[in-house]
């Protein structure tokens, strides 16, 4: 039975040209994490694997930095970065846990951080 929960940074906004940290936290499970994937819609951004470390997709290498922790930092944001981002925790023996973050990249300086929420 999957008992874990993922807490994410929820709905967030940031300014064009700036940077933002995407974070997910898996808790309430003793399952061993073997890999964490970061995806934007259907595109793979980055992987952190237990044995291989970090892999950043070549198309995002210049704008994505791993960390802090298992999070992901997006840099030089453009309006096209607006959309859904997913963290996918691969665990044993539980299986897969997925968290969702919605990022809105704004033209002006009215960007505010949204509330945090939990995905069971």
């Amino acid at each position: 039975m999957m008992t874990g929960t993922i807490e994410t940074t929820g709905n967030i906004s940031a300014e064009k040209g700036g940077s933002i940290i995407l974070q997910c936290h898996l808790s309430s499970t003793t399952a061993q994490v073997t890999q964490v994937n970061w995806e934007q819609q259907d595109q793979l951004l980055a992987i952190c694997n237990a044995d291989l470390g970090w892999h950043i997709s070549p198309s995002f290498k210049d704008r994505v930095a791993p960390g802090p922790g298992l999070g992901l930092t997006l840099q030089s944001l453009t309006v096209n970065d607006t959309g859904e981002y997913f963290c996918i925790y691969h665990t044993y023996p539980d299986g897969t846990y997925t968290g969702r973050i919605f990022l809105e990249v704004l033209e002006s300086s009215v960007a505010e951080h949204g509330a945090r929420f939990q995905i069971p």
Epitope: E7, I21, Q23, H25, L26, S27, T30, V33, T34, Q35, V36, C48, N49, A50, L52, G53, W54, H55, I56, K61, A65, P66, G67, P68, G69, L70
Partner: antibody, heavy 117, light 107 residues
Framework: QVQLQQPGSELVRPGASVKLSCKAS????????MHWVKQRHGQGLEWIGN????????NYDEKFKNKGTLTVDTSSNIAYMHLSSLTSEDSAVYYC??????????WGQGTTLTVSS | DIVLTQSPATLSVTPGDSVSLSCRAS??????LHWFQQKSHESPRLLIN???QSISGIPSRFRGSGSGTDFTLTINSLETEDFGVYFC?????????FGGGTKLEIK
Amino acid sequence: QVQLQQPGSELVRPGASVKLSCKASGYTFTSYWMHWVKQRHGQGLEWIGNIFPGSGTTNYDEKFKNKGTLTVDTSSNIAYMHLSSLTSEDSAVYYCAREGLYAFDYWGQGTTLTVSS
Amino acid sequence: DIVLTQSPATLSVTPGDSVSLSCRASQNIRNSLHWFQQKSHESPRLLINYASQSISGIPSRFRGSGSGTDFTLTINSLETEDFGVYFCQQSNSWPYTFGGGTKLEIK
């Protein structure tokens, strides 16, 4: 197996600079953060900063921004920390540590830096 | 910066006892908290990561719990090899920070 090799000790004069090294082996050097940690006289641990060899991205604690510079040589899998304008306060053990999925899972043995005239 | 406060600073215990070490964060760090053991003249060793995740090769008597701002490392049935200094560390945000440590000594 994963190893982080550091020289045992370095002796330098006050006001001078030193470049500490950390030779990584047994894993893909460019895929893991390398951190540097300071420990004085067996006291607490202080995080200095880190570098991601795959991109050269660095982060520093504000306290060490004007003291240390982190670099890597990806052709030889060596991480470096350059410390400048050394004083007795910089005398300490300096560790390098790898961070991946499982946090700081491997540490070097530490280099004891002595700043003395 | 996130400040991690460990208590007590020193703990005198007898082998066979069970102990709980505390680490408190100055702000919510979710579960981005790791525990290390350091023996004299040795490098730190990772015991628990992400608050409660066990590490391969670490005895099961070491258990981590907590989330948010309050974290605990519990060591059941202490063995003589467990004496040393224990540090917590956060990876929720740069700069990473360490707690001041708890020294576990033989009574």
